[in-house]
Interface confidence: low
Amino acid sequence: GDLLIQKTIKKQVVLEEGTIAFKNWVKTGTEVYRQFWIFDVQNPQEVMMNSSNIQVKQRGPYTYRVRFLAKENVTQDAEDNTVSFLQPNGAIFEPSLSVGTEADNFTVLNLAVAAASHIYQNQFVQMILNSLINKSKSSMFQVRTLRELLWGYRDPFLSLVPYPVTTTVGLFYPYNNTADGVYKVFNGKDNISKVAIIDTYKGKRNLSYWESHCDMINGTDAASFPPFVEKSQVLQFFSSDICRSIYAVFESDVNLKGIPVYRFVLPSKAFASPVENPDNYCFCTEKIISKNCTSYGVLDISKCKEGRPVYISLPHFLYASPDVSEPIDGLNPNEEEHRTYLDIEPITGFTLQFAKRLQVNLLVKPSEKIQVLKNLKRNYIVPILWLNETGTIGDEKANMFRSQVTGKIN
Protein backbone atom coordinates (compact mmCIF):
# COMPACT_ATOMS: atom_id res chain seq x y z
CA GLY A 1 0.00 0.00 0.00
CA ASP A 2 2.53 2.59 1.15
CA LEU A 3 4.87 1.89 -1.76
CA LEU A 4 2.05 2.31 -4.25
CA ILE A 5 1.06 5.62 -2.63
CA GLN A 6 4.68 6.81 -2.74
CA LYS A 7 4.90 5.85 -6.38
CA THR A 8 1.66 7.68 -7.21
CA ILE A 9 2.71 10.77 -5.28
CA LYS A 10 6.10 10.81 -6.94
CA LYS A 11 4.42 10.65 -10.32
CA GLN A 12 1.83 13.35 -9.54
CA VAL A 13 4.19 15.94 -8.06
CA VAL A 14 6.47 16.05 -11.10
CA LEU A 15 6.21 19.42 -12.87
CA GLU A 16 5.19 18.28 -16.32
CA GLU A 17 2.06 18.38 -18.44
CA GLY A 18 -0.65 16.05 -17.13
CA THR A 19 0.16 15.95 -13.42
CA ILE A 20 -1.94 17.44 -10.59
CA ALA A 21 1.07 19.44 -9.46
CA PHE A 22 1.68 20.98 -12.88
CA LYS A 23 -1.90 22.17 -13.33
CA ASN A 24 -1.93 23.97 -9.97
CA TRP A 25 1.62 25.19 -10.42
CA VAL A 26 1.04 26.94 -13.76
CA LYS A 27 -1.95 28.84 -12.37
CA THR A 28 -2.65 28.68 -8.67
CA GLY A 29 -6.10 27.43 -7.80
CA THR A 30 -5.90 29.32 -4.52
CA GLU A 31 -7.07 32.92 -4.21
CA VAL A 32 -4.16 34.97 -2.97
CA TYR A 33 -4.68 38.34 -1.31
CA ARG A 34 -2.19 40.97 -0.29
CA GLN A 35 -3.35 43.22 2.54
CA PHE A 36 -1.52 46.48 3.21
CA TRP A 37 -1.39 48.53 6.40
CA ILE A 38 0.11 51.99 5.88
CA PHE A 39 1.94 53.76 8.71
CA ASP A 40 0.41 57.24 8.78
CA VAL A 41 2.84 59.71 10.40
CA GLN A 42 1.08 61.82 13.04
CA ASN A 43 3.81 64.37 13.85
CA PRO A 44 5.77 65.22 10.68
CA GLN A 45 6.69 68.77 11.76
CA GLU A 46 8.00 67.77 15.19
CA VAL A 47 10.18 65.08 13.64
CA MET A 48 11.59 67.41 11.01
CA MET A 49 12.17 70.33 13.38
CA ASN A 50 13.12 68.59 16.64
CA SER A 51 14.17 65.09 15.64
CA SER A 52 11.34 63.75 17.81
CA ASN A 53 10.28 60.13 17.83
CA ILE A 54 8.09 59.38 14.82
CA GLN A 55 4.51 58.72 15.88
CA VAL A 56 2.79 56.32 13.51
CA LYS A 57 -0.72 54.98 13.31
CA GLN A 58 -1.36 51.98 11.08
CA ARG A 59 -4.32 52.22 8.69
CA GLY A 60 -5.64 49.18 6.87
CA PRO A 61 -6.20 46.66 5.61
CA TYR A 62 -6.25 47.75 1.98
CA THR A 63 -6.59 44.52 0.05
CA TYR A 64 -5.52 43.50 -3.44
CA ARG A 65 -5.97 40.22 -5.25
CA VAL A 66 -2.57 39.03 -6.49
CA ARG A 67 -0.96 36.00 -8.15
CA PHE A 68 -4.01 35.35 -10.32
CA LEU A 69 -2.03 35.26 -13.57
CA ALA A 70 -0.69 32.02 -15.03
CA LYS A 71 3.04 31.53 -15.35
CA GLU A 72 4.38 32.62 -18.73
CA ASN A 73 7.00 31.26 -21.13
CA VAL A 74 6.85 27.84 -19.47
CA THR A 75 9.65 25.84 -21.13
CA GLN A 76 10.73 22.29 -20.29
CA ASP A 77 14.38 21.33 -20.70
CA ALA A 78 14.60 17.54 -21.02
CA GLU A 79 18.38 17.62 -20.90
CA ASP A 80 18.75 18.96 -17.37
CA ASN A 81 15.22 18.11 -16.16
CA THR A 82 14.24 21.69 -15.46
CA VAL A 83 11.32 23.92 -16.33
CA SER A 84 11.72 27.68 -16.74
CA PHE A 85 9.06 30.37 -16.44
CA LEU A 86 8.20 33.97 -15.70
CA GLN A 87 5.82 34.83 -12.87
CA PRO A 88 3.72 37.81 -14.06
CA ASN A 89 2.73 40.46 -11.54
CA GLY A 90 -0.76 41.85 -11.22
CA ALA A 91 -2.82 43.45 -8.47
CA ILE A 92 -6.55 44.19 -8.40
CA PHE A 93 -7.99 46.36 -5.63
CA GLU A 94 -10.73 44.68 -3.57
CA PRO A 95 -12.91 47.48 -2.05
CA SER A 96 -15.12 45.03 -0.11
CA LEU A 97 -12.05 43.70 1.75
CA SER A 98 -10.60 47.16 2.43
CA VAL A 99 -11.20 49.90 5.00
CA GLY A 100 -11.14 52.65 2.40
CA THR A 101 -10.32 53.46 -1.19
CA GLU A 102 -7.14 53.77 -3.25
CA ALA A 103 -7.65 57.54 -3.05
CA ASP A 104 -7.14 57.63 0.75
CA ASN A 105 -4.36 60.01 1.79
CA PHE A 106 -1.41 59.21 4.04
CA THR A 107 1.44 61.23 5.52
CA VAL A 108 4.59 59.25 4.82
CA LEU A 109 8.31 59.78 4.46
CA ASN A 110 9.27 61.49 1.20
CA LEU A 111 10.71 58.49 -0.64
CA ALA A 112 12.70 60.53 -3.18
CA VAL A 113 14.24 62.87 -0.61
CA ALA A 114 15.28 60.00 1.66
CA ALA A 115 16.67 57.94 -1.22
CA ALA A 116 18.51 60.75 -3.02
CA SER A 117 20.12 62.04 0.16
CA HIS A 118 21.34 58.51 0.89
CA ILE A 119 22.61 57.70 -2.60
CA TYR A 120 24.35 61.05 -3.06
CA GLN A 121 26.14 61.67 0.21
CA ASN A 122 28.78 63.99 -1.13
CA GLN A 123 28.38 67.45 0.36
CA PHE A 124 28.56 69.22 -2.96
CA VAL A 125 25.80 67.21 -4.58
CA GLN A 126 23.72 67.50 -1.42
CA MET A 127 23.83 71.27 -1.91
CA ILE A 128 22.44 70.77 -5.42
CA LEU A 129 19.79 68.39 -4.09
CA ASN A 130 18.86 70.90 -1.41
CA SER A 131 18.13 73.61 -3.95
CA LEU A 132 16.01 71.20 -6.03
CA ILE A 133 14.12 69.98 -2.95
CA ASN A 134 13.39 73.56 -1.90
CA LYS A 135 12.49 74.63 -5.42
CA SER A 136 9.99 71.77 -5.74
CA LYS A 137 8.54 72.59 -2.30
CA SER A 138 9.33 69.04 -1.18
CA SER A 139 9.87 68.18 2.46
CA MET A 140 10.95 65.30 4.67
CA PHE A 141 7.37 64.00 4.70
CA GLN A 142 4.69 64.09 2.01
CA VAL A 143 1.00 63.36 1.63
CA ARG A 144 0.25 60.65 -0.93
CA THR A 145 -2.73 58.53 -1.90
CA LEU A 146 -2.57 54.78 -1.40
CA ARG A 147 -2.46 54.25 -5.15
CA GLU A 148 0.44 56.69 -5.57
CA LEU A 149 2.41 55.26 -2.67
CA LEU A 150 2.13 51.66 -3.83
CA TRP A 151 2.09 51.84 -7.58
CA GLY A 152 3.89 55.08 -8.41
CA TYR A 153 3.71 58.86 -8.82
CA ARG A 154 5.81 61.48 -10.58
CA ASP A 155 7.96 63.12 -7.96
CA PRO A 156 8.22 66.94 -8.19
CA PHE A 157 11.77 67.05 -6.82
CA LEU A 158 13.10 64.37 -9.18
CA SER A 159 11.36 66.10 -12.09
CA LEU A 160 13.74 69.05 -11.61
CA VAL A 161 16.90 66.93 -11.80
CA PRO A 162 18.69 68.17 -14.96
CA TYR A 163 19.62 64.78 -16.37
CA PRO A 164 17.67 61.69 -17.46
CA VAL A 165 16.41 59.98 -14.31
CA THR A 166 13.34 57.91 -13.47
CA THR A 167 11.04 60.56 -12.03
CA THR A 168 8.35 58.03 -11.10
CA VAL A 169 8.55 56.72 -7.56
CA GLY A 170 6.48 54.08 -5.77
CA LEU A 171 7.14 51.31 -3.28
CA PHE A 172 6.16 48.66 -5.83
CA TYR A 173 6.71 50.65 -9.02
CA PRO A 174 6.71 49.18 -11.64
CA TYR A 175 4.36 46.27 -10.81
CA ASN A 176 1.39 45.66 -13.11
CA ASN A 177 2.51 44.36 -16.52
CA THR A 178 5.87 43.22 -15.15
CA ALA A 179 7.10 39.73 -14.34
CA ASP A 180 9.43 38.14 -11.81
CA GLY A 181 12.09 35.79 -13.15
CA VAL A 182 13.16 34.01 -15.28
CA TYR A 183 13.04 31.14 -12.78
CA LYS A 184 14.44 27.77 -13.77
CA VAL A 185 13.39 24.98 -11.39
CA PHE A 186 13.91 21.24 -11.31
CA ASN A 187 10.87 19.37 -12.61
CA GLY A 188 11.60 16.25 -10.52
CA LYS A 189 11.57 13.81 -13.42
CA ASP A 190 14.97 12.37 -12.63
CA ASN A 191 15.00 13.05 -8.90
CA ILE A 192 11.76 13.78 -7.06
CA SER A 193 13.64 15.10 -4.03
CA LYS A 194 14.68 18.11 -6.16
CA VAL A 195 11.23 18.97 -7.54
CA ALA A 196 10.45 22.72 -7.52
CA ILE A 197 13.92 23.56 -6.20
CA ILE A 198 15.28 26.61 -7.99
CA ASP A 199 18.25 25.90 -10.23
CA THR A 200 18.73 29.48 -11.45
CA TYR A 201 17.06 32.87 -11.05
CA LYS A 202 17.56 35.43 -13.81
CA GLY A 203 20.09 33.02 -15.30
CA LYS A 204 22.27 32.84 -12.18
CA ARG A 205 22.72 30.59 -9.17
CA ASN A 206 23.73 33.57 -7.05
CA LEU A 207 22.13 36.94 -6.44
CA SER A 208 25.22 39.22 -6.40
CA TYR A 209 23.70 41.19 -3.50
CA TRP A 210 25.42 39.47 -0.59
CA GLU A 211 28.72 37.84 0.25
CA SER A 212 29.38 34.15 0.81
CA HIS A 213 26.51 31.73 1.48
CA CYS A 214 24.03 34.58 1.98
CA ASP A 215 24.12 35.15 -1.77
CA MET A 216 22.90 31.66 -2.66
CA ILE A 217 19.49 30.93 -4.15
CA ASN A 218 18.30 28.09 -1.95
CA GLY A 219 15.26 25.85 -2.06
CA THR A 220 11.95 26.49 -3.79
CA ASP A 221 9.73 29.58 -4.11
CA ALA A 222 7.72 28.31 -1.08
CA ALA A 223 4.62 27.43 -3.14
CA SER A 224 5.62 23.78 -2.80
CA PHE A 225 8.47 21.64 -1.53
CA PRO A 226 9.72 18.19 -2.49
CA PRO A 227 7.31 15.51 -1.22
CA PHE A 228 7.47 13.54 2.04
CA VAL A 229 8.30 16.50 4.26
CA GLU A 230 9.65 15.61 7.71
CA LYS A 231 9.09 17.68 10.85
CA SER A 232 12.83 17.72 11.43
CA GLN A 233 13.52 19.42 8.09
CA VAL A 234 14.60 22.99 7.67
CA LEU A 235 12.72 24.21 4.61
CA GLN A 236 14.73 26.61 2.50
CA PHE A 237 13.08 28.98 0.06
CA PHE A 238 13.91 32.05 -1.98
CA SER A 239 11.85 35.22 -1.89
CA SER A 240 12.54 37.87 -4.53
CA ASP A 241 10.55 40.36 -2.39
CA ILE A 242 13.28 40.33 0.23
CA CYS A 243 16.15 39.65 -2.18
CA ARG A 244 17.36 36.61 -0.28
CA SER A 245 16.85 32.97 0.59
CA ILE A 246 15.45 32.20 4.02
CA TYR A 247 14.18 29.16 5.90
CA ALA A 248 11.28 27.85 7.97
CA VAL A 249 11.18 25.30 10.79
CA PHE A 250 8.39 23.04 12.05
CA GLU A 251 6.15 24.57 14.71
CA SER A 252 2.98 22.49 15.05
CA ASP A 253 0.47 20.08 13.52
CA VAL A 254 -2.57 21.86 12.11
CA ASN A 255 -5.83 20.52 10.70
CA LEU A 256 -6.73 22.53 7.61
CA LYS A 257 -10.20 21.77 6.30
CA GLY A 258 -9.79 18.15 7.35
CA ILE A 259 -6.28 17.86 5.90
CA PRO A 260 -3.41 17.27 8.33
CA VAL A 261 -0.69 19.84 7.59
CA TYR A 262 2.61 20.84 9.17
CA ARG A 263 2.90 24.49 10.17
CA PHE A 264 6.40 25.78 9.42
CA VAL A 265 7.38 29.24 10.67
CA LEU A 266 10.23 31.66 10.07
CA PRO A 267 12.11 31.53 13.37
CA SER A 268 13.45 34.61 15.18
CA LYS A 269 16.93 33.11 14.67
CA ALA A 270 16.62 33.87 10.95
CA PHE A 271 16.48 37.59 11.83
CA ALA A 272 19.13 37.53 14.56
CA SER A 273 22.38 39.50 14.50
CA PRO A 274 25.64 37.69 13.70
CA VAL A 275 26.40 37.91 17.42
CA GLU A 276 23.49 35.55 18.09
CA ASN A 277 23.51 33.65 14.78
CA PRO A 278 26.96 33.68 13.15
CA ASP A 279 25.44 32.39 9.88
CA ASN A 280 23.91 35.84 9.41
CA TYR A 281 27.26 37.65 9.24
CA CYS A 282 26.98 38.11 5.49
CA PHE A 283 23.57 39.81 5.74
CA CYS A 284 25.28 42.64 7.63
CA THR A 285 26.56 44.82 4.81
CA GLU A 286 27.58 47.98 6.65
CA LYS A 287 28.80 48.81 10.12
CA ILE A 288 27.30 52.18 11.04
CA ILE A 289 23.51 51.77 10.88
CA SER A 290 23.86 48.19 12.14
CA LYS A 291 25.95 49.35 15.09
CA ASN A 292 28.80 47.09 14.09
CA CYS A 293 26.39 44.27 13.19
CA THR A 294 24.80 44.13 16.64
CA SER A 295 21.38 45.41 15.53
CA TYR A 296 18.96 42.76 14.34
CA GLY A 297 15.58 42.24 12.75
CA VAL A 298 16.11 44.57 9.77
CA LEU A 299 17.67 43.66 6.44
CA ASP A 300 19.40 46.28 4.32
CA ILE A 301 18.40 45.43 0.73
CA SER A 302 19.74 48.63 -0.84
CA LYS A 303 22.05 46.67 -3.16
CA CYS A 304 18.96 45.00 -4.58
CA LYS A 305 17.10 48.32 -4.90
CA GLU A 306 19.57 50.40 -6.97
CA GLY A 307 21.10 51.90 -3.86
CA ARG A 308 17.82 53.13 -2.38
CA PRO A 309 18.00 52.68 1.41
CA VAL A 310 15.25 50.07 1.71
CA TYR A 311 15.19 47.94 4.85
CA ILE A 312 12.95 44.90 5.18
CA SER A 313 11.69 43.69 8.54
CA LEU A 314 8.79 41.82 10.03
CA PRO A 315 5.69 43.94 10.73
CA HIS A 316 5.95 46.33 13.70
CA PHE A 317 9.64 45.34 13.96
CA LEU A 318 8.79 41.93 15.37
CA TYR A 319 12.04 40.14 16.37
CA ALA A 320 14.02 43.39 15.89
CA SER A 321 16.46 44.92 18.37
CA PRO A 322 15.19 47.70 20.65
CA ASP A 323 17.44 50.32 19.03
CA VAL A 324 15.58 49.85 15.72
CA SER A 325 12.09 50.55 17.09
CA GLU A 326 13.14 53.04 19.80
CA PRO A 327 12.69 56.16 17.57
CA ILE A 328 9.21 55.01 16.42
CA ASP A 329 6.11 55.31 18.61
CA GLY A 330 2.90 53.40 17.93
CA LEU A 331 4.23 49.94 17.10
CA ASN A 332 2.83 46.80 18.75
CA PRO A 333 4.53 43.66 17.50
CA ASN A 334 2.95 40.29 18.19
CA GLU A 335 3.84 36.88 16.82
CA GLU A 336 0.36 35.71 15.94
CA GLU A 337 -0.35 38.66 13.68
CA HIS A 338 3.09 39.50 12.37
CA ARG A 339 5.09 36.33 11.78
CA THR A 340 5.24 34.36 8.54
CA TYR A 341 4.04 30.76 8.34
CA LEU A 342 3.54 28.03 5.73
CA ASP A 343 1.06 25.18 6.17
CA ILE A 344 2.48 22.28 4.21
CA GLU A 345 0.78 19.01 3.38
CA PRO A 346 3.69 16.67 4.15
CA ILE A 347 3.00 13.89 1.65
CA THR A 348 2.89 16.08 -1.47
CA GLY A 349 4.96 18.97 -0.12
CA PHE A 350 2.28 21.41 -1.35
CA THR A 351 1.78 24.65 0.60
CA LEU A 352 -1.99 24.65 1.18
CA GLN A 353 -2.12 27.78 3.31
CA PHE A 354 0.35 30.54 4.00
CA ALA A 355 0.73 34.02 5.45
CA LYS A 356 3.74 35.97 4.25
CA ARG A 357 4.22 39.08 6.34
CA LEU A 358 6.83 41.75 5.85
CA GLN A 359 7.37 45.44 6.44
CA VAL A 360 8.96 47.96 4.09
CA ASN A 361 11.09 50.62 5.78
CA LEU A 362 13.26 53.43 4.49
CA LEU A 363 16.37 54.81 6.12
CA VAL A 364 16.58 58.57 6.53
CA LYS A 365 19.67 60.26 7.87
CA PRO A 366 20.59 63.75 9.03
CA SER A 367 22.20 65.96 6.40
CA GLU A 368 23.88 69.28 7.10
CA LYS A 369 23.38 70.42 3.54
CA ILE A 370 19.74 69.41 3.03
CA GLN A 371 17.54 71.86 4.87
CA VAL A 372 14.62 69.49 5.45
CA LEU A 373 16.94 66.91 7.04
CA LYS A 374 19.40 69.14 8.85
CA ASN A 375 17.62 69.23 12.20
CA LEU A 376 17.67 65.45 12.51
CA LYS A 377 19.97 64.28 15.25
CA ARG A 378 19.82 60.55 14.51
CA ASN A 379 19.17 57.98 11.84
CA TYR A 380 15.64 56.63 11.49
CA ILE A 381 14.58 53.38 9.88
CA VAL A 382 11.10 54.61 9.02
CA PRO A 383 8.26 52.08 8.62
CA ILE A 384 6.21 52.88 5.50
CA LEU A 385 3.86 49.90 5.36
CA TRP A 386 3.49 46.27 6.21
CA LEU A 387 1.80 43.59 4.17
CA ASN A 388 0.15 40.26 4.74
CA GLU A 389 -0.01 38.02 1.69
CA THR A 390 -2.28 35.06 2.31
CA GLY A 391 -3.66 32.09 0.46
CA THR A 392 -5.79 29.14 1.59
CA ILE A 393 -6.85 26.11 -0.38
CA GLY A 394 -10.52 26.43 -1.43
CA ASP A 395 -13.20 24.10 -0.03
CA GLU A 396 -13.67 22.28 -3.33
CA LYS A 397 -9.93 21.77 -3.79
CA ALA A 398 -9.66 20.63 -0.17
CA ASN A 399 -12.35 17.98 -0.70
CA MET A 400 -10.58 16.76 -3.81
CA PHE A 401 -7.27 16.71 -1.93
CA ARG A 402 -8.77 14.79 0.99
CA SER A 403 -10.31 12.15 -1.24
CA GLN A 404 -7.33 11.74 -3.59
CA VAL A 405 -4.40 12.11 -1.23
CA THR A 406 -4.90 12.06 2.53
CA GLY A 407 -8.01 9.87 2.44
CA LYS A 408 -6.17 7.19 0.49
CA ILE A 409 -3.34 7.15 3.00
CA ASN A 410 -5.43 7.06 6.13
Partner: antibody
Framework: QVQLQQPGSELRSPGSSVKLSCKDF?????????MTWVRQKPGHGFEWIGD????????IYGEKFEDKATLDADTVSNTAYLELNSLTSEDSAIYYC??????????????WGAGTAVTVSS | DIVLTQSQKFMSTSVGDRVSVTCKAS??????VAWYQQKPGQSPKALIY???YRYSGVPDRFTGSGSGTDFTLTISNVQSEDLAEYFC?????????FGGGTKLEIK
Protein backbone atom coordinates in the same frame (compact mmCIF):
# COMPACT_ATOMS: atom_id res chain seq x y z
CA GLN B 1 40.40 42.53 -10.43
CA VAL B 2 41.00 46.01 -11.88
CA GLN B 3 37.99 48.27 -11.39
CA LEU B 4 39.49 51.63 -12.31
CA GLN B 5 41.90 51.58 -15.24
CA GLN B 6 44.36 54.42 -15.82
CA PRO B 7 47.18 54.71 -18.36
CA GLY B 8 50.61 54.24 -16.81
CA SER B 9 52.34 57.44 -17.87
CA GLU B 10 52.14 60.64 -19.90
CA LEU B 11 55.05 62.83 -21.00
CA ARG B 12 54.32 66.45 -21.93
CA SER B 13 56.27 69.61 -22.59
CA PRO B 14 55.78 72.79 -20.52
CA GLY B 15 52.81 74.95 -21.57
CA SER B 16 50.92 72.03 -23.15
CA SER B 17 47.92 70.17 -21.73
CA VAL B 18 47.12 66.54 -20.96
CA LYS B 19 43.84 64.66 -20.63
CA LEU B 20 43.98 61.70 -18.25
CA SER B 21 41.38 58.95 -18.38
CA CYS B 22 39.96 56.64 -15.74
CA LYS B 23 37.79 53.80 -17.01
CA ASP B 24 35.37 52.30 -14.46
CA PHE B 25 34.49 48.63 -15.02
CA UNK B 26 31.53 48.82 -12.65
CA UNK B 27 28.93 50.30 -15.01
CA UNK B 28 26.22 50.06 -12.34
CA UNK B 29 28.01 52.26 -9.84
CA UNK B 30 29.87 54.65 -12.18
CA UNK B 31 27.00 57.08 -12.89
CA UNK B 32 25.94 57.46 -9.25
CA UNK B 33 29.32 57.51 -7.53
CA UNK B 34 31.50 60.56 -7.12
CA MET B 35 34.81 60.07 -8.88
CA THR B 36 37.57 61.78 -6.97
CA TRP B 37 40.92 62.82 -8.39
CA VAL B 38 44.00 63.25 -6.19
CA ARG B 39 47.62 63.77 -6.99
CA GLN B 40 50.75 62.66 -5.19
CA LYS B 41 54.00 64.53 -5.52
CA PRO B 42 57.16 63.17 -3.95
CA GLY B 43 57.65 64.97 -0.66
CA HIS B 44 54.25 66.72 -0.91
CA GLY B 45 51.91 63.91 0.07
CA PHE B 46 48.42 63.76 -1.47
CA GLU B 47 46.45 66.71 -2.77
CA TRP B 48 42.74 66.54 -3.53
CA ILE B 49 42.02 67.96 -7.02
CA GLY B 50 38.27 67.62 -7.27
CA ASP B 51 35.18 65.46 -7.63
CA UNK B 52 32.78 64.74 -10.46
CA UNK B 53 29.38 63.10 -10.33
CA UNK B 54 29.09 61.52 -13.81
CA UNK B 55 25.30 61.25 -13.92
CA UNK B 56 24.77 65.01 -13.78
CA UNK B 57 28.27 66.18 -14.66
CA UNK B 58 28.40 68.12 -11.37
CA UNK B 59 31.93 69.10 -10.39
CA ILE B 60 33.73 70.66 -7.47
CA TYR B 61 37.40 71.63 -7.43
CA GLY B 62 40.03 72.33 -4.84
CA GLU B 63 40.82 76.07 -4.85
CA LYS B 64 44.38 75.43 -6.03
CA PHE B 65 43.12 73.51 -9.10
CA GLU B 66 40.22 75.71 -10.23
CA ASP B 67 42.18 77.18 -13.14
CA LYS B 68 44.39 74.17 -13.68
CA ALA B 69 42.02 71.20 -13.92
CA THR B 70 38.82 70.32 -15.79
CA LEU B 71 36.84 67.23 -14.87
CA ASP B 72 34.34 65.54 -17.12
CA ALA B 73 32.86 62.09 -17.68
CA ASP B 74 31.30 59.93 -20.35
CA THR B 75 28.51 57.69 -19.02
CA VAL B 76 28.44 55.65 -22.24
CA SER B 77 32.03 54.43 -21.89
CA ASN B 78 32.00 54.75 -18.06
CA THR B 79 35.12 56.89 -18.20
CA ALA B 80 36.08 59.92 -16.11
CA TYR B 81 38.59 62.45 -17.38
CA LEU B 82 40.95 64.96 -15.82
CA GLU B 83 42.40 67.61 -18.12
CA LEU B 84 45.36 69.66 -16.93
CA ASN B 85 46.31 72.81 -18.82
CA SER B 86 49.32 75.15 -18.95
CA LEU B 87 51.57 72.43 -17.62
CA THR B 88 54.71 73.28 -15.67
CA SER B 89 57.28 71.07 -13.96
CA GLU B 90 55.24 71.65 -10.75
CA ASP B 91 52.49 69.48 -12.27
CA SER B 92 54.76 66.44 -12.50
CA ALA B 93 53.12 63.91 -10.18
CA ILE B 94 51.13 60.70 -10.03
CA TYR B 95 47.44 61.36 -10.61
CA TYR B 96 44.94 58.91 -9.12
CA CYS B 97 41.23 58.48 -9.60
CA UNK B 98 39.33 56.88 -6.71
CA UNK B 99 35.81 56.19 -5.47
CA UNK B 100 33.77 54.28 -2.94
CA UNK B 101 33.00 50.66 -3.87
CA UNK B 102 29.25 50.91 -3.23
CA UNK B 103 28.93 54.32 -4.81
CA UNK B 104 28.18 56.02 -1.49
CA UNK B 105 29.77 59.42 -1.77
CA UNK B 106 30.92 59.96 1.79
CA UNK B 107 34.38 61.14 0.79
CA UNK B 108 36.48 58.08 1.57
CA UNK B 109 37.70 55.76 -1.14
CA UNK B 110 38.35 52.04 -1.26
CA UNK B 111 38.63 51.67 -5.04
CA TRP B 112 41.72 53.30 -6.57
CA GLY B 113 43.16 53.41 -10.05
CA ALA B 114 46.82 52.44 -10.45
CA GLY B 115 47.67 56.09 -11.11
CA THR B 116 49.08 57.91 -14.14
CA ALA B 117 52.58 59.34 -13.82
CA VAL B 118 52.65 62.73 -15.55
CA THR B 119 56.08 64.09 -16.39
CA VAL B 120 56.42 67.67 -17.62
CA SER B 121 59.80 68.20 -19.23
CA SER B 122 61.29 70.03 -22.16
CA ASP C 1 41.56 74.28 4.92
CA ILE C 2 41.80 71.60 7.57
CA VAL C 3 45.40 70.59 8.13
CA LEU C 4 46.17 67.02 9.16
CA THR C 5 49.51 66.58 10.91
CA GLN C 6 51.24 63.24 11.15
CA SER C 7 54.08 64.33 13.38
CA GLN C 8 56.20 61.24 12.93
CA LYS C 9 57.50 60.93 9.39
CA PHE C 10 59.20 57.62 10.18
CA MET C 11 58.59 54.92 12.73
CA SER C 12 60.74 51.91 13.37
CA THR C 13 59.29 48.69 14.77
CA SER C 14 59.90 44.96 14.94
CA VAL C 15 57.77 42.04 13.77
CA GLY C 16 55.30 41.16 16.51
CA ASP C 17 55.38 44.64 18.09
CA ARG C 18 52.50 47.05 18.49
CA VAL C 19 52.78 50.47 16.88
CA SER C 20 50.54 53.54 16.90
CA VAL C 21 50.45 56.10 14.08
CA THR C 22 48.89 59.43 15.07
CA CYS C 23 47.09 62.12 13.11
CA LYS C 24 46.04 65.53 14.45
CA ALA C 25 43.44 67.73 12.74
CA SER C 26 43.63 71.53 12.92
CA UNK C 27 39.90 71.63 13.75
CA UNK C 28 37.10 69.28 14.79
CA UNK C 29 36.34 66.73 12.06
CA UNK C 30 34.06 64.46 14.10
CA UNK C 31 34.82 60.88 13.10
CA UNK C 32 35.13 61.70 9.39
CA VAL C 33 38.62 60.27 9.03
CA ALA C 34 39.95 57.45 6.86
CA TRP C 35 43.31 55.68 6.94
CA TYR C 36 45.21 54.33 3.93
CA GLN C 37 48.26 52.13 3.49
CA GLN C 38 50.57 52.68 0.54
CA LYS C 39 53.38 50.35 -0.43
CA PRO C 40 56.18 51.54 -2.74
CA GLY C 41 55.05 51.72 -6.38
CA GLN C 42 51.43 50.94 -5.52
CA SER C 43 48.23 52.94 -5.17
CA PRO C 44 46.80 53.46 -1.68
CA LYS C 45 44.75 50.75 -0.01
CA ALA C 46 41.86 51.72 2.26
CA LEU C 47 42.12 50.37 5.81
CA ILE C 48 39.71 52.34 8.02
CA TYR C 49 36.73 54.66 7.52
CA UNK C 50 34.68 56.70 9.99
CA UNK C 51 37.75 56.74 12.28
CA UNK C 52 37.27 53.20 13.59
CA TYR C 53 35.49 50.99 11.02
CA ARG C 54 37.67 48.43 9.30
CA TYR C 55 37.06 47.65 5.63
CA SER C 56 36.22 44.02 4.95
CA GLY C 57 39.35 42.03 4.18
CA VAL C 58 41.56 44.25 6.34
CA PRO C 59 43.28 42.16 9.04
CA ASP C 60 41.96 42.83 12.54
CA ARG C 61 45.42 43.78 13.75
CA PHE C 62 44.64 47.21 12.23
CA THR C 63 42.51 49.33 14.58
CA GLY C 64 41.42 52.94 14.24
CA SER C 65 40.35 55.21 17.09
CA GLY C 66 39.73 58.83 17.97
CA SER C 67 37.29 61.64 17.28
CA GLY C 68 37.33 65.42 17.10
CA THR C 69 40.95 66.32 16.42
CA ASP C 70 43.06 63.35 17.54
CA PHE C 71 43.16 60.06 15.66
CA THR C 72 45.25 56.91 15.93
CA LEU C 73 45.88 53.92 13.72
CA THR C 74 47.20 51.03 15.79
CA ILE C 75 48.87 47.97 14.29
CA SER C 76 49.20 45.18 16.82
CA ASN C 77 51.43 42.19 16.09
CA VAL C 78 53.21 43.97 13.22
CA GLN C 79 53.99 41.74 10.22
CA SER C 80 56.73 42.24 7.63
CA GLU C 81 54.07 42.95 4.97
CA ASP C 82 52.99 46.01 6.99
CA LEU C 83 56.12 47.84 5.85
CA ALA C 84 54.48 50.78 4.07
CA GLU C 85 53.51 54.43 4.40
CA TYR C 86 50.29 55.25 6.27
CA PHE C 87 48.15 58.31 5.53
CA CYS C 88 45.13 59.78 7.27
CA UNK C 89 42.47 61.74 5.36
CA UNK C 90 39.58 63.92 6.53
CA UNK C 91 36.30 64.14 4.62
CA UNK C 92 34.42 66.28 7.10
CA UNK C 93 34.50 69.27 4.76
CA UNK C 94 35.89 70.41 1.44
CA UNK C 95 38.63 70.46 0.43
CA UNK C 96 39.43 66.89 1.46
CA UNK C 97 42.90 66.87 2.96
CA PHE C 98 45.51 64.22 3.75
CA GLY C 99 48.18 63.87 6.38
CA GLY C 100 51.81 63.96 5.25
CA GLY C 101 52.25 60.24 5.87
CA THR C 102 54.16 58.05 8.32
CA LYS C 103 56.64 55.51 6.94
CA LEU C 104 56.77 52.30 8.92
CA GLU C 105 60.15 50.60 8.85
CA ILE C 106 60.73 47.08 10.10
CA LYS C 107 63.92 46.65 12.13
Amino acid sequence: QVQLQQPGSELRSPGSSVKLSCKDFDSEVFPIAYMTWVRQKPGHGFEWIGDILPSIGGTIYGEKFEDKATLDADTVSNTAYLELNSLTSEDSAIYYCARDYYGSSYGYFDVWGAGTAVTVSS
Amino acid sequence: DIVLTQSQKFMSTSVGDRVSVTCKASQNVGTNVAWYQQKPGQSPKALIYSASYRYSGVPDRFTGSGSGTDFTLTISNVQSEDLAEYFCQQYNSYPYTFGGGTKLEIK
